[in-house]
Interface confidence: low
């Protein structure tokens, strides 16, 4: 039979890792397999037989592993041995680079390059490299054989310059054992230099200069060169030495400055490896005491508004505030003191808080007093413009120009205007002392005219505030003119007469002229004299007249201004038809009867029949009421004969009857002569 | 006229919360360090807590590191003091201020640190 190791010889491990020896055989059924070393040491490893196999696995690596290891096999009466040798190692890591500190253009610099855990270190070598330049190598083969596992490291000193920025520090590691594969054998580590430039020149410029005035303003601006750049710090060395740190940008402004912030003030260029300073110092002069109060020497207050006075000390830290009235009055408002300002705040003012107000300022020993004047006034509205009517070409018209609620009215100027013409100005300078809000009013009349159409009635109202003020205060109101012409020429066409036969067409046609345009309406005279309304068009159209149509038809022509009125009478005439002529009781009665004749036309008024009675010496027109003829105790020389006509422009029609009366005592009758 | 106007202040309960607000105007805000400081009843200012101009550095004392938390909005002018887990012995006075110590700060009546007129802040155990 045969017997075969794997690896075969000759191995390498590294310490930690797993590592299985094979020993099989060939040409035997079941062998029996035995380990040992070469010194008989422990195995330090673990045995799994199976079959024809026994494997031999070290888990894990250690130093106790270093041996030849011989594997015995026996098949029956025969036996084989082989043997192979186990070399370890350690290289676990790649190299470290250490820095005794950062990188300072200038200043020297130690790097370390570590090699951890290296076993064997005699077997080590470490290159250290900047960019492609080799800095330092060593081979470590001079050291003692020692079984443990140890760091190594080499060490280099150098100073970096600016090019050094952006360039590769490289520590490469090799491990010199033949049966290693190149990966293992060596291992490198890459670090780019981060150079530093520690602050230097650092540098103020101060505008607009280092002496300043108490409230006027400095800016300082601080320059300091570095890698990184630096970034900057104002302070401000107090009285012990501390820096009161005031700003983080490169600009620091100071403003309202005081003498107190006379002083040295530092710049500091500070980055990740060092600082730099420059100093400047401030010196602030004194600037006189001086009292302010605003709004001004003067403040107009309007009735009601709220007023705050405020007294403001210049130049003084810590100042002491008081406030009266001219007159000692009582001060009507809230005094709130706030540093170097005191406010006095009148609410809602009224006539009693017109004075003079002083604000007295101590500083120190010195007192200093300023005032102010408030004057108070009242002028909340615009002018309100009344007309007495519209107006209307030529008729004179009032109007009122009013200003409500005024105060003070003896400086009030009111001003009423045509267009660019004044037509009137009132000033109001007669009421003096006197504290109340009053309505003034200017009133006048003028004329209008057509021309007036178009311009602006303007009232103009100045409040003059004495001498406070150039300006004076104003209000306006303004009113456009429109001016009314009343209605006038009112002219009526009939077509095509106003005398119609009936059943004929007629059109009445109305026109008037006025501003606004005139509105027409059409009526018609009733017999008691009033007006019943028509029509509203300017044509009134009958398309058949009737004999009711006839009658009086007014027009008349409307607007805001007036009325002009034209009438015309309308007369349809008619053709007599149906005359009936009738005679009551009988057309023979008894001297004595009552006898009634009556006459009637279908289509004619009665007022146009005509009752006759017929005689030798002419006829003779009866009086006739509503058409009828009375004869309340007939007489012989009533009987005859009755004739009724009817009669117009158009034509006429006839009727006739014979009456006859008999007499009492001979009861016989008697007959008109003709 | 440099103006600072704090707010936010009030009482509370030991263990609560408040947040200080400071509006600033009268100077270029967004250029200067900021502070918030506090005046116990009886006692002197005390530094609390500084920034630096974009917020991106911040200091505390250290009897507040932990539990207050400054910031700033340069758009608003406005500087904040978000305070935790108060304590009795933080009741005072407290005031913004320009300018910033990292571990002490004075204000002299007479320096270039314009401070506003304070929020009470008072805790209660």
């Known amino acids: 039979f045969k017997i075969e190791i794997s690896p075969e010889y000759k191995t390498i491990a590294q310490i930690g890792d797993s590592m299985a020896l094979t020993c099989s055989t060939t040409g035997c059924e079941s062998p029996l397999f035995s380990w040992r070393t070469q010194i008989d040491s422990p195995l330090n490893a673990k045995v799994r037989t199976e079959g024809s196999k026994s494997v031999l696995t070290m888990e894990p690596v250690s130093f106790e592993n270093e041996h030849s290891y011989l594997c015995t096999a026996t098949c029956g009466s025969g036996k084989l041995e082989r043997s192979i040798h186990v070399d370890i190692y350690s290289f676990p890591k790649d190299p470290e680079i250490q820095f005794s500190g950062p990188l300072e253009v200038g200043k020297p610099v130690t790097v370390k390059c570590l090699a951890p855990d290296i076993y064997p270190v005699y077997r080590l070598e470490i290159d250290l490299f900047k960019g492609d330049q080799l800095m330092n190598r060593q081979e470590f083969s001079s050291e003692e054989m020692t079984k443990s596992l140890e760091t190594k490291s080499l060490e280099v000193t150098f100073t970096p310059v600016i090019e050094d920025i952006g360039k590769a520090l490289v520590c490469r590691a090799k491990l010199h054992i033949d049966q290693i594969d190149s990966t293992l054998k060596e291992r490198e580590t890459v670090k780019e230099l981060q150079v530093y430039i520690s602050p230097r020149n650092t540098t103020i410029s101060v505008h607009p200069s280092t002496r300043l005035q108490e409230g006027g303003a400095v800016t300082m601006t601080c320059s300091s060169e570095g890698l990184p750049a630096p970034e900057i710090f104002w302070g401000r060395k107090l009285d012990n030495e501390v820096l009161q740190l005031l700003s983080g940008n490169a600009t620091l402004t100071l403003i309202a400055m005081r003498m107190e912030d006379s002083g040295v003030y530092v710049c500091e260029g500070v980055n990740l490896i060092g600082r730099d300073k420059a100093e400047v110092e401030l010196v602030v002069q004194e600037k006189p005491f001086i009292v302010d109060i605003s709004p001004g020497s003067q403040v107009a207050a309007q009735v009601g508004d709220s007023v705050v006075l405020t007294c403001a000390a210049i130049g003084c830290d810590s100042p002491s505030f008081s406030w009266r009235t001219q007159t000692d009055s009582p001060l009507n408002g809230v005094v709130r003191n706030e540093g170097a300002k005191s406010t006095l705040v009148l609410s809602s003012v009224g006539f009693e808080d017109e004075h003079s107000y002083l604000c007295a300022v101590t500083c120190l020993q010195r007192t200093l007093e300023k005032r102010t004047q408030v004057e108070v006034y009242s002028f909340p509205e615009d002018p309100v413009i009344k007309m007495s009517g519209p107006l209307v070409h030529g008729r004179p018209v009032t109007v009122n120009c009013t200003v409500p609620n005024v105060y003070p009215f003896d400086h009030l100027e009111i001003e009423l205007l045509k267009g660019e013409t004044t037509l009137m100005k009132k000033y109001f300078l007669e009421e003096m002392g006197i504290k109340s809000l009053e309505t003034k009013i200017l009133e006048t009349t003028f004329i209008p005219t057509i021309e007036d159409t178009g311009k602006s009635l303007v009232c103009l109202a100045r409040l003059h505030s004495g001498e406070m003020e150039s300006e004076p205060k104003q209000r306006q109101s303004v009113q456009p003119l429109y001016v009314n012409v009343a209605p006038k020429e009112t002219t009526i066409w009939v077509s095509p007469s106003p005398i119609l036969e009936e059943g004929s067409p007629v059109n009445l046609t109305c026109s008037s002229d006025g501003i606004p345009a005139p509105k027409i309406l059409w009526s018609r005279q009733l017999n008691n004299g009033e007006l019943q309304p028509l029509s509203e068009n300017t044509t009134l159209t009958f398309m058949s007249t009737k004999r009711d149509d006839s009658g009086i038809y007014v027009c008349e022509g409307i607007n805001e201004a007036g009325i002009s009125r034209k009438s015309v009478e309308l007369i349809i005439q008619v053709s007599p038809k149906d005359i009936q002529l009738t005679v009551f009781p009988s057309k023979s009665v008894k001297e004595g009867d009552t006898v009634i004749i009556s006459c009637t036309c279908g289509n004619v008024p009665e007022t146009w029949i005509i009752l006759k009675k017929k005689a030798k010496t002419g006829d003779m027109v009866l009086k006739s009421v509503d058409g009828s003829y009375t004869i309340r105790q007939a007489q012989l020389q009533d009987a005859g004969i009755y004739e009724c006509e009817s009669k117009t422009e158009v034509g006429s029609q006839l009727r006739s009857l014979t009456l006859d009366v008999k007499g009492k005592e001979h009861n016989k009758d008697y007959f008109s002569p003709e | 006229q440099v103006q600072l106007q704090e707010s936010g202040g009030g009482s509370v309960q030991a263990g609560g919360s408040l947040r200080l607000s400071c509006t600033a105007s009268?100077?270029?805000?967004?250029?200067?360090?900021m502070s918030w400081v506090r005046q116990a009843p009886g006692k002197g200012l005390e530094w609390v807590s500084g920034?630096?101009?974009?917020?991106?550095?911040?200091y505390y004392a250290d009897s507040v590191k932990g539990r207050f938390t400054i910031s700033r909005d340069n758009a608003k002018n406005t500087l904040y003091l978000q305070m935790n887990s108060l304590k009795s012995e933080d009741t005072a006075l407290y005031y913004c201020?320009?300018?910033?110590?990292?571990?002490?700060?004075?204000?002299?009546?007479?320096?270039?640190?314009?401070k506003g007129q304070g929020t009470q802040v008072t805790v209660s155990s």
């Open positions: 009268g100077f270029t805000y967004s250029s200067y360090y």
């Open positions: 201020a320009t300018g910033s110590g990292r571990d002490s700060y004075d204000c002299y009546s007479g320096s270039w640190c314009p």
């Open positions: 920034i630096n101009v974009d917020g991106s550095n911040t």
